[in-house]
Interface confidence: medium
């Protein structure tokens, strides 16, 4: 290796940095500007810095930090832009117009962000005079074609030295459809933000999953029984770039990406099988989706984590060909083992996500591999759905966006190349993309964890149930058509058909309200039974269900919550098939106290823990203290059955009032589960004060503590069964 | 409106103790803590401690634990703070105050000024 | 006990300008999602009168000039503009566990 002196390596504008111990540095320029002429530099064993070359091959002699632009429109058809620039600087904003008997799609404003991308879609003016919409033209690009009728072929080309992502040639299909993706011209140096990358590449994989989904329910011929049948496959395969110019600790990041990826993909509910392959001059497959451990989470993120960054230190160039050729050769033989001509090797899906920093280097070109995973599953219009590949590159500067381009999928509406200004962008995607709520079907559990989630989207089950007035009580889904509550909201007696219940619904922040169809009150409730034992209200049996008058269509701001002791929990928390409910209770409360949540009046999402064993005997004692409620009490399990969870302990927050039949839930594998329902407490933190906002800390001095109590539903199974027996699949006690 | 009114002036002397009255009227009385705060002259704030009406139980500051003693009497919504083994430097103006949803002294009564002189 | 530590001690500012007093806590007074630190106005011969509560809410009935920020350890009492009425001594005060604590006060004068 070359040792390299600093002299003259400074870039105008902005600053570097040393990677690799000193064989190479990367330019860093404030945002809004990129560095000019590349990103980055290797120190030559002739003790030189790569020199700095423009993309057209000229010398350049000192590096620099360049504003940012965006690229001009090269035509818009039908209308008129403005203002009229050669290219437009960061913040910048260009108008559309369109001529009369022309309705614009897309965006009429778009600014240009200091990625050097546009915000927005593309503005179109259109007629809808042909069978298939006007496909537009992306700002930058020029297209040739301008029928729209089925089979007409638009093509497309970028202008000066900008680079063409997506399809360079379109086909009006018969579904009205035009083939492929859209083409957007960008500058080269050009990124994508992680926070445009999540939902795209989340929108692609959850049409991908929800294909996938093996919860296709088929009656039985005995019974009323729902069967969940287990159809769907995935093989995702995860090829991580381990070349000399990924340092090892982007190698840890992209590995640890990929763990997140593994974690969320296996919180789906299908079958999933995971390679895992590094590369740099040579491939090296460290798990191959023919070993049955790669259907297993544990194994492959062990596999994962056991990925070496010194395995390729002998090779160190960049075969993307090899790494896919060994995609492959991985197919062919899974193919040899179940028939080319059986449904098992014909139903799998397959998912390619290709983490990279640059160009390959060696092997040929990578598209030829591609063209040969294409032939193997015989990938037509009709199967286009079987294999999707993503192309994501990391560094800005150095990836080739032709190159990524030709490997990434091309489906309408869906992107599959992507690049990432750092590996820090990467993790970010990774962590945000795979956003379940977007399915449409009644998968339970599912919580969108994105931080700028809304409260409703991160706890869609959670609904108001309230008189003709004021709410009284919450409650959750628990399918799509039943909601779980506590009794106690009921216990005046009002005519239930006077109530409503207001469910979340992506088109109003009021959410949508349903009438009751039927009120199931459990019989044994009475707030009055042991009145004459001197114990003023008792909360035994607090439990009811609401059957809604019409069903709960699914979105990110509906969705039911997992029930432990169903088929459908069972799934969620990826368990063998002969599971039981214990199996489920010693899972879920398997510890002396089990972090958990509420939801409060707000909405927000509110913490408690769940004291189990000697600890719940501790922290159900207290309730003796309380001489107002229980004035002459010798026994607290008189109060305090076997039926109740107990929290308020340390730094719990406690349930107001009003947020009683509210989910007591946890979260385990990215789904959450319902082990009880908001009762009874011994501390209000809301009383007094008429803000949502405003909860009252108990004081510090108050006796009795605070203390709350919550249905346990692991002991309220014979009930629940009694009612949801033909809604819900309950797995045996 | 929530109004708390204070005890009168008292002059003590070093040694003795002091008892300080706190009259709550306009809300219900066991619903919220009451607090004790003394402010030297020309000085600062300083939380004696604070008691909860509907349980009768008491937070204290150390510096005044075993010296300070709050009671209250629920029947005539009165909250009581006695301070003894009195010194010269705890004259000061004593406050009550009423917490509020938030644990902050939302009403003030208006003071009571303590002097200890020999 | 957490130790509140308020700056400056005093300050002169004109009539119709910004006055910033800070508070520093020792420890965190945040718990469950909300800052427990309030500020407080006082006048000479008058006892405390509550301005902001929970580090960042406006008391009803304080004028909007008022307002406070910060989260965890470092807190702002901002008056946007100021008024005659406004000279007073200041202070932070958190409840976040026993003992509560005050800071030791800020003068702030017109200029």
């Known amino acids: 290796a070359g040792s390299c002196s600093l002299e003259g390596v400074e870039i105008k504008g902005g600053s570097f940095r040393l990677l690799q111990e000193g064989q190479a540095l990367e330019y860093v320029c404030p945002s809004g500007f990129y560095p000019y002429p590349v990103q980055t530099r290797t120190c030559r064993s002739t003790g030189s810095w790569s020199t700095l070359k423009t993309q057209d091959q000229k010398t350049v002699r000192k590096a620099e930090c360049r504003a940012v632009r965006c690229p001009a429109p090269v035509s818009f058809e039908n209308g008129i832009y403005t203002p009229r620039l050669g290219s437009y600087p960061v913040g910048g904003n260009v108008s559309f117009e369109c001529e009369d008997g022309f309705i614009l799609r897309g965006s009429p404003v778009r600014q240009c962000r200091p990625n050097g991308m546009w915000d927005g879609e593309t503005a179109v003016c259109d007629n809808g005079a042909g069978h298939c919409p006007n496909p537009g033209i992306s700002l930058g690009a020029v297209r040739t074609g301008f029928r729209f009728g089925h089979g007409d072929k638009v093509r497309y080309r970028c202008s000066s030295n900008l680079v063409l992502t997506g399809s360079s040639e379109r086909e009006c299909q018969g579904n009205g459809v035009w083939s492929g993706t859209e083409p957007i011209c960008r500058q080269p140096y050009s990124y994508d933000f992680p926070e445009d990358v999540a939902p795209a590449l989340g929108t692609s994989f959850s049409h991908m999953l929800g294909a996938t989904n093996p919860t296709q329910k088929t009656k039985e011929s005995l019974g009323r029984k729902i069967q969940i049948q287990r159809s769907g496959h995935l093989n995702l395969y995860l090829l991580l770039d381990c070349s000399q110019s990924v340092s090892e600790n982007d190698f840890l990041i992209f590995k640890e990406s990929a763990s997140l990826m593994v974690d969320r993909i296996f919180s789906f509910e299908i079958n999933v099988s995971v390679a895992i392959i590094t590369f740099a001059s040579e491939p090296k497959v460290l798990m191959s989706v023919l070993n049955d451990n790669s259907r297993d989470m544990t194994e492959v993120i062990s596999s994962l984590e056991n990925a070496n960054y010194k395995d390729h230190e002998n090779g160190t160039g960049t075969n993307t060909y090899a790494a896919l050729n060994s995609v492959y050769l991985m197919m062919n033989n899974q193919m040899r083992l179940l028939g080319m001509e059986t449904m098992a090797w014909q139903e799998i899906r397959h998912a390619i996500i290709l983490l990279t920093d640059g160009k390959s280097n060696m092997g040929g070109s990578p598209k030829t591999a591609v063209d040969h995973i294409r032939e193997i599953l015989n990938i037509n219009q009709k199967r286009n759905d079987y294999l999707d590949i993503y192309a994501i590159g990391v560094g800005k500067l150095d990836v080739d966006w032709r190159e990524l381009n030709e490997l990434g999928s091309k489906k309408d509406g869906e992107r599959h190349a992507f690049i990432l200004q750092d590996t820090k962008a990467l993790h970010q995607v990774f962590e945000h993309m795979l956003d379940v709520s977007k399915l449409t079907d009644t998968i339970c559990g599912v919580g969108n964890m994105s931080a700028n989630a809304s409260d409703q989207e991160r706890t869609p089950w959670h609904v108001t149930i309230k008189p003709k007035s004021q709410e009284t009580c919450r409650g959750a889904l628990i399918s799509d058509q039943w909601v779980l509550t506590a009794a106690h909201c009921f216990r005046d007696g009002n005519d239930h058909s006077l109530w409503r219940v207001n469910v979340g619904d992506p088109k109003s922040q009021w959410g949508k309200e349903f009438l009751i169809e039927k009120a199931v009150i459990s019989p044994g409730f009475d707030v009055f039974a042991k009145k004459n034992q001197g114990i003023l209200e008792f909360y035994g049996d607090d439990i009811a269900l609401l059957k809604l008058a019409q069903k709960v269509k699914m979105s990110t701001h509906a969705r039911p919550i997992c029930l432990p002791c169903t088929m459908e929990a069972n799934l969620a928390l990826r368990r063998p098939q002969g599971s039981t409910c214990r199996d489920h209770e010693n899972e879920l409360l398997n510890k002396q106290s089990v972090p958990a949540h509420f939801v409060a009046l707000n909405g927000s999402k509110l913490n408690i823990n769940l004291k189990m064993g000697v600890e719940w005997t501790s922290c159900a004692e207290v309730v003796s203290q309380e001489k107002t409620m229980f004035p002459n009490l010798t026994d607290v399990r008189e109060v305090v059955t076997d039926q109740f969870l107990c929290s308020g302990t340390q730094e719990d927050e406690s349930p107001c009032k009003g947020e009683s039949g509210g989910a007591v839930f946890l979260e385990r594998r990215f789904r959450f589960f319902q082990v009880g329902l908001v009762s009874w407490g011994l501390y209000n933190p809301c009383l007094g004060s008429a803000d949502k906002n405003s909860r009252k800390r108990a004081p510090r001095s108050k006796v009795p503590p605070p203390r709350d109590f919550h249905i346990n539903l692991f002991r309220m199974q014979p009930w629940l069964r009694q009612h949801l027996g033909d809604v819900l699949n309950f797995l045996p006690l | 409106e929530v109004q708390l009114v204070q005890s009168g002036a008292e002059v003590k002397k070093p040694g003795a103790s002091v008892k300080v009255s706190c009259k709550a009227s306009g809300y219900t009385f066991t619903d919220y803590n009451m607090d004790w705060v003394r402010q030297a002259t020309g000085q600062g704030l300083e939380w004696i401690g604070d008691?909860?009406?509907?349980?009768?139980?008491?937070g204290y500051n150390q510096k005044f634990k075993g010296r300070a003693t709050m009671t209250v009497n629920k029947s005539i919504s009165t909250a009581y703070m006695e301070l003894s083994s009195l010194r010269s430097e705890d004259t000061a103006v004593y406050y009550c105050?009423?917490?509020?949803?938030?644990?902050?002294?939302?009403?003030w009564g208006q003071g009571t000024l303590v002097t200890v002189s020999s | 006990d957490n130790v509140l530590t308020q700056s400056p001690d005093s300050l002169a500012v004109s009539l119709g300008e910004r006055a910033t007093i800070s508070c520093r806590a020792s420890k965190s007074v945040r718990t469950s999602g909300y800052n427990y630190m309030h500020w407080y106005q006082q006048k000479p011969g008058q006892p405390p009168k509550l301005l902001i509560y929970l580090a960042s809410n406006l008391k009803s009935g304080v004028p909007d000039r008022f307002s406070g920020s910060g989260s965890g350890t470092d807190f702002t009492l901002t008056i946007s503009s100021l008024q005659a009425e406004d000279a007073a001594t200041y202070y932070c005060?958190?409840?976040?566990?026993?003992?509560?604590?005050f800071g030791q006060g800020t003068k702030l004068e017109i200029k």
């Open positions: 105050a009423r917490e509020d949803d938030h644990d902050a002294f939302a009403y």
């Open positions: 005060q958190h409840s976040r566990e026993l003992p509560y604590t």
């Open positions: 008691i909860n009406p509907n349980y009768e139980s008491t």
